[in-house]
Interface confidence: low
């Protein structure tokens, strides 16, 4: 069983490496756009057990203008250069299957994703009206501040809902 071609997302492209069941692919925002905070670029080929038909999950991805380019004056056509967009490796959470929102990077700086430090998991408190999620941080080598190892840290949403792309603890993106 395989999935059909995935849906299109405005201002984004996807290069599918595998259409097989349970494969995960990532949309990449086009040059000049970046992923909106709180949206997920991940899609997964899943099986609808009722119909036995495979389909791609709907990504919550929203690509918005790159803030660095919003106020820049366009260069003459002969001198325009576009930074290549490359997928960024995923940061992993301790367990589970759901994707946590992550992103490609379209910076010119060398961006890397640091692995989780074993044993650094925080135990967040959970209240009925507050969604709590444990989030792994990404790191980037960009001068100051210094490059360090990422560690899990707890963020608590003060809103009564979680933004799209933020998933409850115990879920992770394992790609």
């Amino acid at each position: 069983i395989t999935c059909p071609p995935p849906m299109s997302v405005e201002h984004a492209d996807i290069w599918v490496k595998s259409y097989s069941l349970y494969s995960r692919e990532r949309y990449i925002c086009n040059s000049g756009f970046k992923r909106k905070a709180g949206t997920s670029s991940l899609t997964e080929c899943v099986l609808n057990k009722a119909t036995n038909v495979a389909h791609w999950t709907t990504p919550s991805l929203k690509c918005i203008r790159d803030p660095a380019l919003v106020h820049q004056r366009p260069a003459p056509p002969s001198t325009v250069t576009t930074a290549g967009v490359t997928p960024q490796p995923e940061s992993l959470s301790p367990s589970g299957k759901e994707p946590a929102a992550s992103s490609p990077s379209s910076n010119n700086t060398a961006a890397t994703t640091a692995a989780i430090v074993p044993g650094s998991q925080l135990m967040p408190s959970k209240s009925p009206s507050t969604g709590t999620t444990e989030i792994s941080s990404h790191e980037s080598s960009h001068g100051t501040p210094s490059q360090t190892t990422a560690k899990n840290w707890e963020l608590t949403a003060s809103a009564s809902h979680q933004p799209p792309g933020v998933y409850p603890q115990g879920h992770s993106d394992t790609t």
């Epitope: 709180g38 929102a101 910076n107 809902h161």
Partner: nanobody, 124 residues
Framework: EVQLVESGGGLVQAGGSLRLSCAAS????????IGWFRQAPGKEREGVSC????????YYAGSVKGRFTISSDNAKNMVYLQMNSLKVEDTAVYYC?????????????????WGQGTQVTVSS
């Protein structure tokens, strides 16, 4: 040009308060999430707080929850971090950054913009 300029740091006694400010320019403020990170000498960079302007959601690291409050003034393109009940371990350089609240891209990755930092020193 994207610019983030922090201010408001200083020396304060344990239990005291400070209010950090971040003046943002060069991008459409309410399209992005902005937050605060800190780094103490010889320690790992640590996320402090984040605000997703799309829906007003705010996030806090467990170590500062209940003591720190993030807020913004979209009209002025300003983000604030009110820090109460400060502890010696809060001593660090605090950076304002465009980031992603969902995965917390610490000063890099998706959005690679941050300020020059402001020093906060809490004495006992």
């Amino acid at each position: 040009e994207v610019q983030l300029v922090e201010s408001g740091g200083g020396l304060v006694q344990a239990g005291g308060s400070l209010r950090l400010s971040c003046a943002a320019s060069g991008f459409t403020f309410d399209d992005y999430a902005i937050g605060w990170f800190r780094q103490a000498p010889g320690k790992e960079r640590e996320g402090v707080s984040c605000m997703d302007s799309s829906d007003g959601s705010t996030y806090y690291a467990g170590s500062v929850k209940g003591r720190f409050t993030i807020s913004s003034d979209n009209a002025k393109n300003m983000v604030y971090l009110q820090m109460n009940s400060l502890k010696v371990e809060d001593t660090a350089v605090y950076y304002c950054a465009i980031l992603d609240c969902a995965v917390v891209t610490t000063l890099g990755g998706e959005y690679d913009y941050w300020g020059q930092g402001t020093q906060v020193t809490v004495s006992s």
